[in-house]
């Protein structure tokens, strides 16, 4: 689940089994000139960044929950 910083896709691989408990924020990057795929990068409670699989049902649920909590704040 390493995260690269160059101007290309940042997610080299994604983590399986992610749990929402330690997720502080989620950044959804839409496809663009530097990366043809959607990327989901979570920032964990300890500051570590983790790439998530945007196609995973649980990740979709986590993103939806985070976006809803952002709207209500």
């Amino acid at each position: 689940a390493s995260v690269a910083t160059e101007l290309r896709c940042q997610c080299l691989q994604t983590l399986q089994g992610i749990h929402p408990k330690n997720i502080q924020s989620v950044n959804v990057k839409s496809p663009g000139p530097h990366c043809a795929q959607t990327e989901v990068i979570a920032t964990l409670k300890n500051g570590r960044k983790a790439c998530l699989n945007p196609a995973s049902p649980i990740v979709k649920k986590i993103i939806e929950k985070m976006l809803n909590s952002d709207k209500s704040n």
Epitope: N46, G47, A50
Partner: antibody, heavy 119, light 107 residues
Framework: QVQLQQSGAELVRPGSSVKISCKAS????????MNWVKQRPGQGLEWIGQ????????NYSGKFKGKGTLTADKSSSTAYMQLNSLTSEDSAVYFC????????????WGQGTSVTVSS | DIQMTQSPSSLSASLGGKVTITCKAS??????IAWFQHKPGKGPRLVIH???ILQPGIPSRFSGVGSGRDYSFSIRNLEPEDIATYYC?????????FGGGTKLEIK
Amino acid sequence: QVQLQQSGAELVRPGSSVKISCKASGYAFSDYWMNWVKQRPGQGLEWIGQIYPGDADTNYSGKFKGKGTLTADKSSSTAYMQLNSLTSEDSAVYFCARERDYDVAMDYWGQGTSVTVSS
Amino acid sequence: DIQMTQSPSSLSASLGGKVTITCKASQDINKYIAWFQHKPGKGPRLVIHYTSILQPGIPSRFSGVGSGRDYSFSIRNLEPEDIATYYCLQYDNLPWTFGGGTKLEIK
């Protein structure tokens, strides 16, 4: 490599308190939740609670609230569990277990600390 | 709190055989179930998390499946070192809760 070293066995009197420790090494202690689990003789595992050493955030099972306190000392990478007003029901082996950051699986466990409450 | 009902509480199987343990949650746990192997005098060992993901170093003889409220854990080609008590753990919602355990013995 990750290691969790727990303190030795305790024989304590009913009504007294005990504080057991779990010294972590091989990882960034402050960055991972530490869980505590109880096993009474001949019984199964029971989750007690957890502490996040980085900010001292805690979560407890309802059954354990009021029975004790979880603390952590970042300078020595040691987690503690204090149990108060001990009764025979508290006689058990207590385990500490690190919780992985992204998937919260308890991937590393201490060897256990036996607490015997007897007069 | 979520209750985890684990069965059977004990089972006996032959070397080389297969065993299956089940856990039923009192509500949907979104695949957040782990399975642990526990031997006397040692700390429990994580075998599987998130229903089916094998912990590194665990042989592929171990497997897990399930969704919603119903989950199972299997060991095939049983070996002597598999003798232990196995526990399921739900970690969908705090407080985390364990199943009652299954003591595995070899015939």
